[in-house]
């Protein structure tokens, strides 16, 4: 057969479907690769074809589409099942072609099963909310094309095992799942069980996904630096190590790029040509508020480093804060010669 | 001193994932450094792939998201980046480098490796 | 995105000129912005970070000054191993951004 332009294997679309449940794959060529659309495709003479390399097997197979109940179907660019089995893992092509014009790509399908509390290896989405916002919603994902418009389905909402029926803050309504005021105690796995009848037959749709309830932009501010501080001064002789922690407490922020660093005169520590390590922590609240630790050390620290000035710095996407550690030389304790004189006897 | 040196192979196809490593020497990845991936296009400018930090935080240029991955391997003391669905505007040179939090800049970089996507 | 211009695109000097390069941006970044000098073949190379300050190893006729928008790269006496591109990079929002470049070549 002449050439075809084959853009491999798209590992980009890792697609991964419950067993025993409705799916539908779009054919990705039209999504990725090529600039026109399937209908333009179609008016143009070309035709989509279809076939699969079964899991663990090298020989491309046509999809058998004759299966009874039109198990497996294809409708415009979209492969159909009505529903999935655990053997219908495998590398999925769709192909475009005529008698002058070829072009195709593969893509991954994984039929993954669950348990009865909808565990499974599938990878879950996650939806962050802000603890204590009003009211935040959550959507069934991934349903639509499934059912037209005229199909009113039932929606059955869980949360981890427990279907979710007068709960305190969370509610169902349909598609959605509202959270009235999101608490640490809402974090979990959410699961929505769409059932929606076609030709006579009752089909489920499951998806899952983890709600995180995070730190509220309201109560979001710029960096606060604990340490150094005015209360604590690092006070050394010459020889001695010299650590001064900077401790930094960042608000969760969506996306934001937590920094702490430290100055040494005005320079990068690299940049000062003394013996400098710099040691970091970091440790997250439940809401996913962050501290940082900075330790600066300088094992044998001399006069010279003693009269340098150190400065944590510290930003976030709510600002920038810096501050200076109080670094000074111990000074000696004097040394008291004491004298006993006893020689003021009478004679 | 911290050297950076880029591995990988120098011919992807398209629509195949660009996978690089960069080895970490005289330093460790767990210092508090961003390790990041910035890429020249042959006879152009230089462009901000994205970075992670020493503890597994990443950022990506929004332009690449979609398509990125920066992860750390620390028993190897080396970072990596994927680069999936390629095609020929992928074709640069990628750099790893060093970068220093706040506006300490890129001070430790790779010597670079060409990536062309062809079939 | 910050959008970094600079200009000149393209400048001849000669050895023992001073010449200044100019990196301006979209909005304001404070002082979070680096140059970097790259030779044909090479990696860039780190000559000044926030705005002003000399990298470690760079020669002092280096010199680099602004903030906000506004930032200047100056070459106090032009050595022959400073003809090269010279390019601004901003730090300050994601994505991070360089500026286009500006050739810098022997008159």
């Known amino acids: 057969s002449e050439r075809c332009d084959d853009w491999g294997l798209d590992t980009m679309r890792q697609i991964q479907v419950f067993e025993d449940e409705p799916a539908r794959i779009k054919c990705p060529l039209f999504e990725h690769f090529l600039k026109f659309n399937y209908s333009t495709a179609h008016s143009a003479g070309l035709t989509l074809i279809w076939y699969w390399t079964r899991q663990d097997r090298d020989l491309e197979e046509p999809i058998n589409f004759r299966l009874p109940e039109n198990r497996i179907s294809k409708e415009k660019d979209v492969l159909w099942f009505r529903p999935t089995l655990l053997n219908d893992t495998g590398n999925y092509t769709c192909m475009l072609r005529n008698t002058t014009y070829c072009s195709k790509v593969a893509f991954p399908l994984e039929v993954v099963q669950k348990d009865s509390c909808f565990n499974s290896p599938m990878k879950l989405p996650v939806h962050k909310l802000y603890i204590e916002y009003g009211i935040q919603r959550i959507t069934c994902p991934n349903v639509d094309g499934y059912f037209p418009s005229s199909v009113k389905p039932t929606i059955t909402w869980y949360m981890g095992c427990y279907k979710i029926q007068n709960f305190n803050n969370v509610i169902p309504e349909g598609m959605n799942l509202s959270f009235l005021i999101a608490l640490i105690s809402n974090n979990g796995n959410y699961t929505c069980v769409v059932t929606y009848p076609e030709n006579g037959r009752t089909f489920h749709l499951t998806r899952t996904l983890t709600v995180k309830v995070v730190g509220s932009p309201k109560n979001a501010v710029p960096p606060v630096i604990h340490s150094p501080n005015d209360h604590v001064v690092y006070e050394k002789e010459p020889g001695e190590e010299l650590l001064i922690p900077c401790t930094v407490y960042f608000s969760f922020l969506m996306d934001s790029r937590n920094e702490v660093w430290w100055t040494i005169d005005g320079k990068k520590p690299d940049d000062i040509t003394i013996d400098v390590t710099i040691n970091e922590s970091i440790s997250h609240s439940r809401t996913e508020d962050e501290t940082r630790t900075q330790i600066l050390s300088i094992k044998k620290v001399t006069s010279e480093d003693l009269k340098r000035s150190y400065v944590c710095h510290a930003r976030s996407a709510k600002g920038e804060v810096a501050k200076a550690a109080k670094v000074k030389q111990k000074v000696p304790a004097p040394r008291y010669t004491v004298e006993l004189a006893c020689g003021f006897g009478a004679t | 001193q911290v050297q950076l040196q880029e591995s990988g192979p120098g011919l992807v196809k398209p629509l195949g994932t660009l996978s690089l490593t960069c080895a970490v020497s005289g330093g460790s990845i767990s210092n508090s450094n961003w390790w990041s991936w910035v890429r020249q296009p042959p006879g152009k400018g230089l462009e901000w792939i994205g970075e992670i930090y020493h503890s597994g935080s990443t950022n990506y240029n929004p332009s690449l998201k979609s398509r990125v991955t920066i992860a750390l391997d620390w028993s190897k003391n080396q970072f990596s980046l994927q680069l999936r669905s390629v095609t020929a505007a992928d074709t640069a040179v990628y750099y790893c480098?060093?970068?220093?939090?706040?506006?300490?800049?890129?001070?430790?970089w790779g010597q670079g490796t060409l990536v062309t996507v062809s079939s | 995105d910050i959008q970094l211009t600079q200009s000149p695109s393209f400048l001849s000097a000669s050895v023992g000129d001073r010449v200044t390069i100019s990196c301006r941006a979209s909005?304001?970044?404070?002082?979070?912005l680096a140059w970097y000098q790259q030779k044909p073949g090479k990696a860039p190379k780190l000559l000044i970070y926030a705005a002003s300050t000399l990298q470690g190893g760079v020669p002092s006729r280096f010199s680099g000054s602004g903030s906000g928008t506004t930032f200047t790269l100056t070459i106090s006496s032009l050595q022959p191993e400073d003809f090269a591109t010279y390019y601004c990079q901003q730090l300050n929002t994601y994505p991070f951004t360089f500026g286009p470049g500006t050739k810098l070549e022997i008159k």
């Open positions: 480098a060093r970068y220093g939090s706040g506006p300490f800049g890129g001070d430790c």
């Open positions: 909005q304001g970044i404070s002082s979070y």
